[in-house]
């Protein structure tokens, strides 16, 4: 089923630090914090502070915006490649309006909007341009070679006219949080399994450490019990079968866990945590990905 929009309390959507998941069609009680079965794995790299944890931040770049509305000033960040992420609960879409733009299109400056069913490069006629994402998250990347140049954006959110989510899908934002697999009542639809989306700040990576129990034995066919973890950006997928402690690291700032129908029917369980990691190697801010026509 398509489910109903999730209603995340304002303070959860905008607050710093860890988040708990709310299913797309469930009541808020589901998202109450649950105790962990074990401590997370030793964290090989330091935890990155979430942008909301810094009371003063010198640059817009690298921030994750979770409030219902806000202004993002990407003018003059001093970085050739500046990225921000906007996240809202499942069942909402992100709206964007360009208030000011001083991008030099002839010099190769560009604004890139990236998200599910969204890939758009723009530069010309940006002023007062409005845009709506297809789903609840959006990454905005700005390529600007000139100091002081850039865009000023206003973003908002609204209920999605259509949803791509299943009734039991869940969303997590922020630099760290607790992961608990859904436990479904017989009335809840789980056709195709349930998904958990994790979005952190741009340029960060995601580490997941969790314990899977009661997984059952089936690994093939329609009733297979498995967990898939996908790196949303790089299309990399890792499959986990059977009871185990799993550890996984992403390449990008967006990940997705899928709990199969067989996993749910077996009343299997997964509990753990995710946190953010730095890139393995510091990125040179010289993106090559800006080639191509506008509007593609």
């Amino acid at each position: 089923g398509q489910g109903t929009p999730s209603l995340v309390p304002h303070e959860e959507a905008a607050a710093p630090g860890r988040t708990t998941a709310t299913p797309a069609g469930a009541s808020l009680e589901w998202s109450q914090a649950r105790g962990l079965l074990f401590s997370p794995a030793p964290q090989p790299r330091r935890l990155l502070p979430g942008p909301q944890e810094n009371s003063v931040q010198s640059s817009a770049c690298g921030r994750q915006h979770l409030e219902p509305t806000g202004t993002i000033d990407m003018r003059g960040p001093g970085q050739a490649d500046c990225a921000v992420a906007i996240g809202r609960p499942l069942g909402e879409v992100v709206t964007l309006r360009v208030l000011e733009s001083s991008l030099n299109c002839s010099a190769g400056d560009m604004l890139l909007l990236w998200g599910r069913l969204t890939w758009r490069k723009m530069c010309r006629k940006l002023l007062d341009m409005t845009f709506s994402s297809k789903t609840n998250t959006l990454v905005v990347r700005q390529r600007c070679g000139r100091p002081g140049g850039g865009v000023l954006l206003r973003y908002g959110s609204q209920l999605a006219p259509e949803t791509f989510y299943r009734e039991c899908d869940m969303q997590l934002f922020g630099p760290w949080g607790e992961i608990v697999s859904p436990s479904l009542s017989p009335a809840t639809s789980n056709a195709g399994g349930c998904r958990l989306f994790i979005n952190v700040a741009p340029h960060a990576r995601i580490a997941i450490h969790a314990l899977a129990t009661n997984m059952g034995a089936g690994t093939e066919g329609a009733n297979a019990s498995y967990i898939l973890i996908r790196d949303t950006h790089s299309l990399r997928t890792t499959a986990f079968h059977g009871q185990q402690v799993l550890y996984w690291e992403s390449e990008s700032s967006q990940a997705e866990m899928e709990f199969s129908e067989g996993f749910l029917k077996a009343q299997a369980s997964l509990r753990g945590q995710y946190w953010t990691l730095q890139s393995w190697v510091p990125e040179m801010q010289d993106p090559q990905s800006w080639k191509g026509k506008e509007g593609t």
Epitope: L228, E283, S289
Partner: antibody, heavy 117, light 110 residues
Framework: QVQLQESGGGVVQPGRSLRLSCTDS????????MHWVRQAPGKGLEWVAG????????YYADSVKGRFTISRDNSKNTLYVQMNSLRGEDTAVYYC??????????WGQGTLVTVSS | ELVVTQPPSVSAAPGQKVTISCSGS????????VSWYQQFPGTAPKLLIY???KRPSGIPDRFSGSKSGTSATLGITGLQTGDEADYYC???????????FGGGTKVTVL
């Protein structure tokens, strides 16, 4: 056991179009990202395009951007690539590959596309 | 122009060890996982290594992978005549938003 079977290759004139298909005989098609990779005669592997498990993300090599379109139909366990404005340099064996960069990686046996007048 | 480079060929006697390097940048190998593929003439490539150093089931432990900084290495110990093939590294390039392959390395058993 996963079996990927490409079809639709053949000889086509420059500037014309061709659509390749790749059918998965297994249960797991809809779980994984799918890719097209090509190999020109005597040359190395070149990634062409990739698509997420649910079709919501598509990526393309610069060499085919704007000319090729990747798509999938999970109800039919089938992956497609629509190739327009074909050029001589598109001549290659085209492979479809599942989960190209993960441990559940599978490749088809390939279909030959020859672009020639 | 390839953004990930490999030596065109390497060779060694049976039973010896060969290593194949794969060199890239921070936007590909440096910050993404590397896979290695083996291809015999006229056949589809086969996955040997994924996530830098993991072997799929059925791949012998003579094959190993490692990564350091912006370079990756495939090692083959106890070289056999049946290992004569082309070997490719592959990774994701975050700047290009694309999978990139090295140009391939031909392994010859002397």
């Amino acid at each position: 056991q996963v079996q990927l079977q490409e079809s639709g290759g053949g000889v086509v004139q420059p500037g014309r179009s061709l659509r390749l298909s790749c059918t998965d005989s297994g249960f797991t098609f809809s779980r994984y990202a799918m890719h097209w990779v090509r190999q020109a005669p005597g040359k190395g592997l070149e990634w062409v395009a990739g698509i997420s498990y649910d079709g919501s993300y598509e990526y393309y090599a610069d060499s085919v951007k704007g000319r090729f379109t990747i798509s999938r139909d999970n109800s039919k366990n089938t992956l497609y690539v629509q190739m327009n404005s074909l050029r001589g340099e598109d001549t290659a064996v085209y492979y479809c590959a599942r989960d190209l960069r993960g441990g559940e990686d599978y490749w088809g046996q390939g279909t030959l596309v020859t672009v020639s007048s | 122009e390839l953004v990930v480079t490999q030596p065109p060929s390497v060779s060694a006697a049976p039973g010896q060890k060969v290593t194949i390097s794969c060199s890239g940048s921070t936007s590909n190998i440096g910050n993404n996982y590397v896979s290695w593929y083996q291809q015999f003439p006229g056949t589809a490539p086969k996955l040997l290594i994924y996530d830098n150093n993991k072997r799929p089931s059925g791949i012998p432990d003579r094959f190993s992978g490692s990564k350091s900084g912006t370079s990756a290495t495939l090692g083959i110990t106890g070289l056999q005549t049946g290992d004569e093939a082309d070997y490719y590294c592959g990774t994701w390039d975050s700047s290009l938003s694309a999978v990139v392959f090295g140009g391939g390395t031909k392994v010859t058993v002397l």
